[in-house]
């Protein structure tokens, strides 16, 4: 595929015009997400608002300039981020003796990018350089894609419900995914 | 032995609503994510959704968002699908299912079954 | 969402027949392709799951082989009571989609 999509750290993110980018997870007032009809964005219909947990695979727009060592992007170009999680809690508490273990009920998916597209940018660089034409990859859509435990060995997938046994050694995860007992999420769309 | 039952047949007017219950059995119900799959008549299968009973989470497919509504009773293990602003292409049996899983190969399949509820939409 | 395109569509057999339903999916699906069997009135039952994994009690002349794209289910010698529908399902990416179905009748 040959593209490279220039991004670093000085890297311009601007929402796009009309587009309201939400912060990640971690940042999100978990009060302010409602019921699965609104699909997990800000409420604008007057449904039930629920604490929520997780979101939806979102394709969120943003417009940043891309960068190149000291070159610029002539104008912004716009992409999408896939943001958010797939569904429902699929880890379960599993209290054994006082630790407390997590183990799936069913398997795990990440929104990840689907496809992507190709867009030539014009870099325009100080001192009077010559202006340089890139090739960049940007995501054109997202999917919920399945993740095995075997991708990542940090994901606590090495026993089911059908096979539940401890793990010695193992720590459950950061901020997991678990589904509490009293614990609402929000209801996802895929 | 594993079981699903799920309640009998509807029969609905177009613009009405359904609630389809499954009463699970010898298993404990807590531990796997209930999914709603259906079949319309002399059609594929079609996955409708599943909910986590733990915490009333659900995620839906696409196709049915803002119709839908999934919800489980953890004291009588009952998963319940509502389907609303019916149409006759809603005509179908609904099906609930229960994941299987393969440590081995890390893997999930839909294992155990309801028998199935028909709901026909008819004005 | 991945489109699983099975065919035939149906098929005319007789007991003894070897006989092969391929399934394609619209990209990559890995392994996680699962194959059900479901008679006239009845529930799906699950036959194989990872392409080629055999449930329990399912015998043995099912059988499926494939990754990637395209994937095979064969029955290496068909029984009386393996007249049936069969579906081809992919676990790889939400939604969870299915194949058409392949009804295999008798000849």
């Known amino acids: 595929q040959g593209w490279q999509a220039f991004k670093n750290d000085a890297t311009e993110i601007i929402p796009e015009l009309g587009e309201y980018p939400e912060p990640p997870p971690e940042l999100e007032n978990n009060k302010t997400m409602n019921r699965a009809e609104n699909g997990g964005r800000p409420p604008h219909h007057p449904f039930e608002t629920k604490d929520v947990s997780e979101y939806s695979c979102r394709e969120l727009h943003f417009t940043r300039y891309v960068t190149d060592g000291q070159c610029r992007s002539a104008k912004p170009v716009t992409e999408l981020v896939c943001s958010g999680q797939c569904g429902p809690a699929r880890l379960l508490p599993n209290a054994i003796g006082r630790g407390k273990w997590w183990r799936p009920s069913g398997p795990d998916f990440r929104c990840i990018p689907d496809r992507y597209r190709a867009q030539r940018v014009q870099l325009l660089c100080p001192g009077g350089a010559a202006p340089r034409a890139r090739k960049v990859r940007l995501v054109a859509s997202c999917k919920c894609k399945r993740l095995t435990r075997f991708h990542n060995q940090s994901e606590l997938k090495d026993f089911g419900p059908e096979a539940a046994r401890p793990q010695k050694g193992r720590k459950p995860r950061p901020r997991a995914r678990g589904a509490k007992a009293n614990q609402a999420e929000l209801e996802n769309a895929y | 032995e594993v079981q699903l039952v799920q309640s009998g047949a509807e029969v609905k007017k177009p613009g009405a609503s359904v609630k389809v219950s499954c009463k699970a059995s010898?298993?404990?119900?807590?531990?796997?994510?209930m999914h709603w799959v259906r079949q319309a008549p002399g059609q594929g299968l079609e996955w409708m959704g599943e909910?986590?009973?733990?915490?009333?989470?659900?995620g839906y497919n696409q196709k049915f968002k803002g119709r839908v509504t999934m919800t489980t009773d953890t004291s009588t293990s009952t998963a319940y699908m509502e389907l609303r602003s019916l149409r006759s292409d809603d005509t179908a049996v609904y099906y609930c299912?229960?994941?299987?899983?393969?440590?081995?190969?890390?893997?999930?399949?839909?294992?155990?079954w309801g028998q199935g509820t028909t709901v026909t939409v008819s004005s | 969402d991945i489109q699983m395109t099975q065919s035939p569509s149906s098929l005319s057999a007789s007991v003894g027949d070897r006989v092969t339903i391929t399934c394609r999916a619209s990209?990559?699906?890995?392994?996680?392709l699962n194959w059900y069997q479901q008679k006239p009135g009845k529930a799906p039952k699950l036959l194989i799951y990872?392409?080629?994994r055999l449930l329990s009690g399912v015998p043995s002349r099912f059988s499926g082989s494939g990754s990637g794209t395209d994937f095979t289910l064969t029955i290496s010698s068909l029984q009386p009571e393996d007249f049936a529908t069969y579906y081809c399902?992919?676990?790889?990416?939400?939604?969870?989609?299915f194949g058409g179905g392949t009804k295999v009748e008798i000849k």
């Open positions: 299912a229960r994941l299987g899983y393969d440590d081995i190969y890390d893997d999930w399949y839909f294992h155990v």
């Open positions: 010898g298993y404990t119900f807590t531990d796997y994510n």
């Open positions: 909910i986590n009973p733990n915490s009333g989470g659900a």
């Open positions: 990209q990559d699906i890995s392994n996680y």
């Open positions: 990872h392409t080629s």
């Open positions: 399902q992919q676990g790889d990416t939400l939604p969870y989609t």
